[in-house]
């Protein structure tokens, strides 16, 4: 049994890091393998993660971690029984994938303005809470070409757009994702999408 692709890990910069790797053949990850991890810190203890299968030869492990700070470094040991298959380390702050925003809501009762709001996925004491920016994706269910991205570079988790920038009388969907420039993170997953029917009063034409 050998490791074909070494573990690569990403952190949500809160409490979970996810590590994925591939073995050289079909493997029952949960029965055959264990990933041991430990924060390099005087008051830390070793933890064991039981991996799950992720495709025939792929394995994935969800590591429960202490609140992350930038200096953290974890040692990782991948074992198959008594055999050490791979040894490495992981700095969560260098491999961050933020949590996805939640509670995306479209408020349509503001005069001819759409107000989209969502929740910051981090608690106020987390470093990323004040460092996230967002991308909002809006698309038409009827017209695949009617697809747009709005970049929200301010901290407030909201976006206002004129309802008239979208077509009236048809249904739209929206979703939102986050990233943090300070740690050069990847984008989060998209939030679940929300649907609304876009309708607004057309301005009277002057003749």
């Amino acid at each position: 049994m050998k490791v074909l692709q070494e573990p690569t890990c990403v952190s949500d910069y809160m409490s979970i890091s996810t590590c994925e790797w591939k073995m050289n053949g079909p493997t029952n990850c949960s029965t055959e393998l264990r990933l041991l991890y430990q924060l390099v810190f005087l008051l830390s203890e070793a933890h064991t993660c039981i991996p799950e299968n992720n495709g025939g030869a792929g394995c994935v492990c969800h590591l429960l971690m202490d609140d992350v700070v930038s200096a953290d470094n974890y040692t990782l040991d991948l074992w198959a029984g008594q055999q050490l298959l791979w040894k490495g380390s992981f700095k969560p702050s260098e491999h961050v994938k933020p949590r996805a925003p939640g509670n995306l809501t479209v408020h349509t009762n503001v005069s001819d303005t759409l107000l989209l709001t969502w929740s910051n996925p981090y608690p106020p004491d987390n470093y990323l809470y004040n460092h996230l920016t967002y991308a909002v994706n809006i698309w038409s269910e009827n017209d695949p070409a009617d697809f747009r991205i709005y970049n929200v570079t301010y901290l407030e988790p909201s976006l206002r757009i004129a309802a008239s920038t979208l077509k009236s009388g048809i249904s739209y969907r929206a979703r939102v994702r986050a990233w943090a420039q300070c740690y050069n993170t990847t984008w989060s997953e998209w939030s679940p999408s929300t649907k609304w029917h876009n309708s607004y009063r057309e301005p009277f034409e002057q003749h």
Epitope: S15, V40, L43, E45, D66
Partner: antibody
Framework: EVQLVQSGGGLVHPGGSLRLSCAGS????????MFWVRQAPGKGLEWVSG???????NYADSVKGRFTISRDNAKNSLYLQMNSLRAEDMAVYYC?????????WGQGTLVTVSS | EIVLTQSPGTLSLSPGERATLSCRAS???????LAWYQQKPGQAPRLLIY???SRATGIPDRFSGSGSGTDFTLTISRLEPEDFAVYYC??????????FGQGTKVEIK
Amino acid sequence: EVQLVQSGGGLVHPGGSLRLSCAGSGFTFSRNAMFWVRQAPGKGLEWVSGIGTGGATNYADSVKGRFTISRDNAKNSLYLQMNSLRAEDMAVYYCARGRYYFDYWGQGTLVTVSS
Amino acid sequence: EIVLTQSPGTLSLSPGERATLSCRASQSVSSSYLAWYQQKPGQAPRLLIYGASSRATGIPDRFSGSGSGTDFTLTISRLEPEDFAVYYCQQYDHSAGWTFGQGTKVEIK
């Protein structure tokens, strides 16, 4: 808002015991290492003890064998049991959250050791 | 055990002046594990700088940290009245734990 609220200081005779408490709020207590740091009157800061999220502990040589740090994650609370107290243990004791450094501190509680 | 020595013991300056505080370690310290605190009379210390140069949340940009190895510096670019206090450096070591410098008092001249 992160808050650490301390209680339990007071006057104790040499050789006596005292228990300090620290209640945390505004953060996930169970995922953070916690510490006690003290400051003798007119002196500098001295790290006393720390406890990790899994319960691993460490002590300054000056208190080893006499002080015991503990935590109750269900109550979001940190404790310091101080036995065989000496005159040199007299100080303001602070609880703190942190790891390699201490980012939030309690208000401090005075421990007076005197006969 | 790593010993941190701060200098000067006292710094007498006027508001608006630049303050430069030194922290010297008896052996090399990882920059990731060097922090600075401010303490005012009757108050708990407050984290100013961590990782030798990163400002903690809510700390004004007139405070900056620098250095590596055994020599670290805290600089206050323009002293405000509320900056007169005692400043401590602190380091963490994987074997020895946490130690503080003896402090530098910044007082009004």
